[in-house]
Every structure is written in structure tokens, then in C-alpha cells.
Interface confidence: low
Amino acid sequence: AESCTSRPHITVVEGEPFYLKHCSCSLAHEIETTTKSWYKSSGSQEHVELNPRSSSRIALHDCVLEFWPVELNDTGSYFFQMKNYTQKWKLNVIRRNKHSCFTERQVTSKIVEVKKFFQITCENSYYQTLVNSTSLYKNCKKLLLENNKNPTIKKNAEFEDQGYYSCVHFLHHNGKLFNITKTFNITIVEDRSNIVPVLLGPKLNHVAVELGKNVRLNCSALLNEEDVIYWMFGEENGSDPNIHEEKEMRIMTPEGKWHASKVLRIENIGESNLNVLYNCTVASTGGTDTKSFILVRKADMADIPGHVFTR
């Protein structure tokens, strides 16, 4: 079943079929006898009840308010009311671009890496039974694809695939022909899976500390998925029970790179932790990058130039 219209603010293009489906649909079936009403308010008009006689373009079916098609003057607020349930939507109908096969404000942007899997499938589940045929256009030129019911592109992306892809569904309703357009702006970007990993921040960091206190040394890097980030300290790692490597945190950027962060926690700082190197290293197939931290007693920090301190 088609999901309900949960978004409170909706923008649609004039001249296309459109529907609003309230989100207590299953409940409405259980209480058929309950009065269910749809209202519209816009500008000076306050809460005008809608029914099929309101306009030849409006149809009401169970949980759905349909527009055949939606027009500029349908802009406004819509309400569904049933017993003690109310749902509200704000509908903004925008002008169709008469000079293009799509309207720029109704474009979904997607970024695809070159050589990665790229797919466009033309589907419209709500109007599926009414759709006669569907065409897929690239930059407003029709693509000749085998399946004219649900045209699909499935391939490994190439730079030439960049462009605007428009799925246009043609359907009949009450003897009239309508179309619904969904456009994707596909940007193909360089395969960025192998950047040169870099540790962020200064290469040498003096950290002012107090004996007996705790400190957290944060090491951050921009790296590839398969790269590793690790801490090295002392003669053999793990010999000091007061030193703990925290779990590595990674977040992915939209371009498929990774920001990694790994914290070294030193508890109950002692003399043995001072003036020794705590090294953080990022390693990849292309080499390594290392940055160092040195713990310095707060009282001694006057001896060190200010610019070497971490913020």
C-alpha cells in the first residue's frame, strides 16, 4: 500500500496529478461510520470543506484527496479531520517550466562515483494501474530502452552519464491524458577512494597537564576506508594500565571519504608520562603520516613557545 503523506510542507508542479493521503488510514476503515472531512484554507478563505462538487478536478477516495491535475490556485493549507484526529499539510504549487521537460525546483540531486553502480528506475506505485507507458529522458532527449512500463538504467557509472534524467509517466483518467515527471540531477565525480591520508592539525603538540589528572589526546585524520589509524607509545604498547586507546570513530563524507578520530586516554598522569612521545599514525598503501603529543607539566609550560600548544 502507498505510504501516507507525512511531510507537512509539499511543493508540486502545476498540471500534474497529485494526491494527499492522511496517516490514520487503517483507523478510518475500522470506523466507516465516522464523519471524515477535507478542508482547504488559503488567504481570505477560511476552512472551506472540499467535496467532489468543489471542483471537477478533485476526487475523494477513502483516505485520499486527489487532484486531476493540481493547479496554481490549489496552493494553500489542507486539513483532514475525523473524530479527534486532524492532519494538516501546506501545499505550494509552482509553475511548470514551459521550455524544458522538467521544472528545476523539483529536481532530486544525486552524486555517483565513476565506476560505481548507478541505477535509475522509473516507478510510481500510487498511479501504477493507470499508467499506460513511461519514458525516460536524459537532458530532455528520450532514451530508447526496452521496457516501456518501468524503464531502468543499471550500469557502472561513467562521466558521460552525468545529466538530468526525467521519468515521465503517461496516464489516462476520465478520458484525459496526464503525465507525471520525476527528475534526478546525476553528478558523476572522480573515484575518490584513494586519497592521500592526512592527519589533521600540527605535527608536534605539547599538552600542558597536571599530575594526578586525566587527559584525552585526540587524533583525527582524513583517510580511505581501508586505511588504519593507531597510537604508539612507550617501549611496548599496553604496559601502562593508566593508558587506554578508545574506540575509533568514523564518519563518512558525502563523497565517500572518511573522517576518523581515535582518542588516547591517560588517567592519573604520573612523572613517567611526562616528556615522552605519544605518536599517532595513519597508515595506507601509499605510506604513513605521524603526529606526536608530548605531555608537559603545567608549571613548565612557560619554557615552551606559545605556538606549539594545542588549542
Partner: antibody, heavy 118, light 112 residues
Amino acid sequence: QVQLVQSGAEVKKPGASVKVSCKASGYTFTGYYMHWVRQAPGQGLEWMGWINPNSGGTNYAQKFQGRVTMTRDTSISTAYMELSRLRSDDTAVYYCARDMGDLFFDYWGQGTLVTVSS
Amino acid sequence: DIVMTQSPDSLAVSLGERATINCKSSQSVFYSSNNKNYLAWYQQKPGQPPKLLIYWASTRESGVPDRFSGSGSGTDFTLTISSLQAEDVAVYYCQQYFITWTFGQGTKVEIK
């Protein structure tokens, strides 16, 4: 310290090409993307494209595709931007800018003024 | 492309007073996977290249005075100079780096 030093001002005739250079120092040249941004006199900033100095891969703004070519010479840590079929509205200051990884631009060159005039 | 619109185009503020510049993007530049807004602010003085002030919408670049601050999320962003100094006279640009890179048209800040 990080420095991006660009080539000097150029005067070109319409239809000609111009090649601007950007020499990087103070960091690992192949570790950061290099972008080119231009600014027409009294106008705002316009992104033109980037080059990955490590692989030589490029990505150009749609507006400049077919007219712009970005290259690099890793042996001298220099990025180049060549713009062909120049028009008078290409008169602008052209900047190179370093990018830590498809993000914001943390260092900029001083700019190169390209004047296109018949 | 994502269109960035700044307001006002120019702003005259007395020394020591607050200056506020707004920037609106035509679509959200917030990326839910890492909770970041892909927006930066730059300062450009006459005859100089732009200088990075703020990135991730609110993170101040190292060395930038703390009178500069950035705020906002999604499509609406603000750069605030809490107490305008003579050296802050410049043109300020917002830039999105979510899908390619686009800049606002710039806001000129002058002393009243």
C-alpha cells in the same frame, strides 16, 4: 608555511587561450585537491573546477566544460588552469585554492588577473 | 546547482556594534549521516584573495578572532561580527560545499 604562488597578469585577445600556474609549497602537494575560482571585476566568486594532484583526475563546473583544462606537474608542485576560446566576459582574477578533501578552501593563491580585450 | 543568496547586499555598522549577515541556500546543505552543515564563510578585503573564517557553519578557523561566529542549519545561516572593528571592513561570502561548490553574491560591510 603553506603558500600558493600564482603566475603574473595576462592580457589576451578574444579567441585566444590563457594558462595560469599555481606553485604550492609548505605542504604535500599531492595530498590536497586544488580548485580554481574566478572573480570578474566588482563581482562575486565563481567555482570553475578541481584537480586531484595525486591522480590528475579533474571535475569541471558545467559552465566551463569543453573550455577549461586543469593539469599538474607533481615534480615542481604546480597546478595549471588553461582556459581556451576566451571572451571579454572571461576578464577576471583567477584564484587557485587548496581543499583538504572535497570541503572548504583553507588557503588561496594571490590571484592572477586575466584581461581579454581586442 | 545550489543557489546561495545573501542579505543584505551591503551593511553599514558603527564601530563596536554588531553586524549580522544572512545566507540562504536553495536546498538543505545539512548531511544527516555526520550531523554537519556543509557551509563556510570567507572574508575578502580589496585586492586580496578570500580568507576562510568559518567552516561546518559554526567552526572558527584557527587564528580568526572570536568576535566572528557562525550559526544556522539546513538552508538558513548567519555570520555575526559581535563588535565591528575597523579591520573588519570587507566583503563577506558564504559558500556551500555539499554538492559541488557555490558562493553567495557577497555582502559588503562598511563603517557607519
